[in-house]
């Protein structure tokens, strides 16, 4: 059992074409956090926010991920193949790495409202 | 297999600055769930943590050696150093560096280097 | 700063014996203890990490146990290349301490 917990926006929708924000949090933890990785579903990574560095936004997605806010990542011109999973992986020290899950669902539907709701994976 | 080697002087004058340094081979410095840290041990006595690096620079020291102590990375040679200014013949020690891991819960020291002896005298 | 406290700091066992090394922190330090094994000379090894887990590579006569503020580290059987000093550490906070060692030595 970690120290901290990581609280993300869960299960979320939006809908195709449009944008969605991925966030997690942090919290009940003194540890210093020294980086901040995004993984695709495929365990690509999207980008990387370093406490020394700033962001680096992978070539592959710099069309369409723009960083923030805060360590969160907003994906932008959604796609149905964006649909899956999604992780925000903290390092911290002395702590050693927390994991969060996201998972996003891309609905052709215009009805399809973009839920963001923060809960503990 | 990961290797750890300390390099520097083996003696150092009073209020001078102690530099070392610690290659790394057999895995990279740049690996993104590791840290690296420097540990004493003055002679007959106990284990001290001076601090620890992340690859891109973000430090944490110890606070008992207050603004004495820097580390750098040499990601490009995959090294880190210890820089430790103004020492005293209470830095004399033996000086380790070591690997923060493996991927667990407030991970341990997995990987040490052999340590290397130095001595603060004129 | 969490101060870590061992005990004993010293003791003599025979080969075979069953050694159980202890230490205490000042405060909870949850489950975030690991131990090591240094012989003269040479680095400290890791032996067990998160109070109980064996680091790959380490015979299975080591053990430890332990949670909170009190922790053991527990020799089955005493071997003749298990003579050497013992640490504990915590790594649940920095700045990281280490306990000040249990040298175990022949009887």
């Known amino acids: 059992m970690m120290t901290g917990t990581i609280e993300t926006t869960g299960n979320i929708s939006a809908k195709k074409g449009g944008s969605v924000i991925l966030q997690c949090h942090l919290s009940s933890t003194m540890a210093q956090v020294t980086q901040v990785n995004w993984e695709q579903h495929d365990h690509s990574l999207l980008a990387i926010r370093n406490a020394e560095l700033g962001w680096h936004i992978y070539p592959a997605f710099k069309d369409r991920v723009a960083p923030g806010p805060g360590l969160g990542l907003t994906l932008q011109s959604l796609t149905m193949n964006d649909t899956g999973e999604y992780f925000c992986t903290y390092h911290t020290y002395p702590d050693g790495t927390y994991r969060g899950r996201i998972f996003l669902e891309v609905l052709e539907s215009s009805v399809a409202e973009h839920s963001a709701r923060f809960q503990i994976p | 297999q990961l290797q750890l080697q300390e390099s520097g002087p083996g003696l150092v004058k009073p209020a001078e600055t102690l530099s070392l340094t610690c290659t790394v081979s057999?895995?990279?410095?740049?690996?993104?769930?590791?840290?690296w840290t420097w540990i004493r041990q003055p002679p007959g006595k106990c284990l001290e943590w001076i601090g620890t690096?992340?690859?891109?620079?973000?430090?944490f020291h110890n606070p008992s050696l207050k603004s004495r102590v820097t580390i750098p990375v040499d990601t490009s040679k995959n090294q880190f150093s210890l820089k430790l200014s103004s020492v005293t013949a209470a830095d004399t020690a033996v000086y380790y560096c070591?690997?923060?891991?493996?991927?667990?819960?407030?991970?341990?020291?997995?990987?040490w280097g052999q340590g290397t002896l130095v001595t603060v005298s004129s | 700063d969490i101060q870590m406290t061992q005990s004993p700091s010293s003791l003599s066992a025979s080969v075979g014996d069953r050694v159980t090394i202890t230490c205490r922190a000042s405060?909870?330090?949850?489950?975030?203890l690991n131990w090591y094994q240094q012989k003269p000379g040479k680095a400290p090894k890791l032996l067990i990490y998160?109070?109980?887990s064996l680091q790959s590579g380490v015979p299975s006569r080591f053990s430890g146990s332990g949670s909170g503020t009190d922790f053991t580290l527990t020799i089955s059987s005493l071997q003749p290349e298990d003579f050497a000093t013992y640490y504990c550490?915590?790594?649940?906070?920095?700045?990281?301490?280490f306990g000040c060692g249990t040298k175990v030595e022949i009887k």
């Open positions: 998160a109070a109980s």
């Open positions: 057999g895995g990279s410095i740049s690996s993104y769930d590791h840290y």
């Open positions: 690096v992340y690859y891109s620079g973000s430090t």
């Open positions: 070591a690997r923060v891991g493996p991927d667990v819960s407030h991970p341990p020291f997995d990987y």
């Open positions: 550490q915590q790594s649940y906070s920095t700045p990281i301490t």
């Open positions: 405060q909870s330090i949850s489950s975030y």
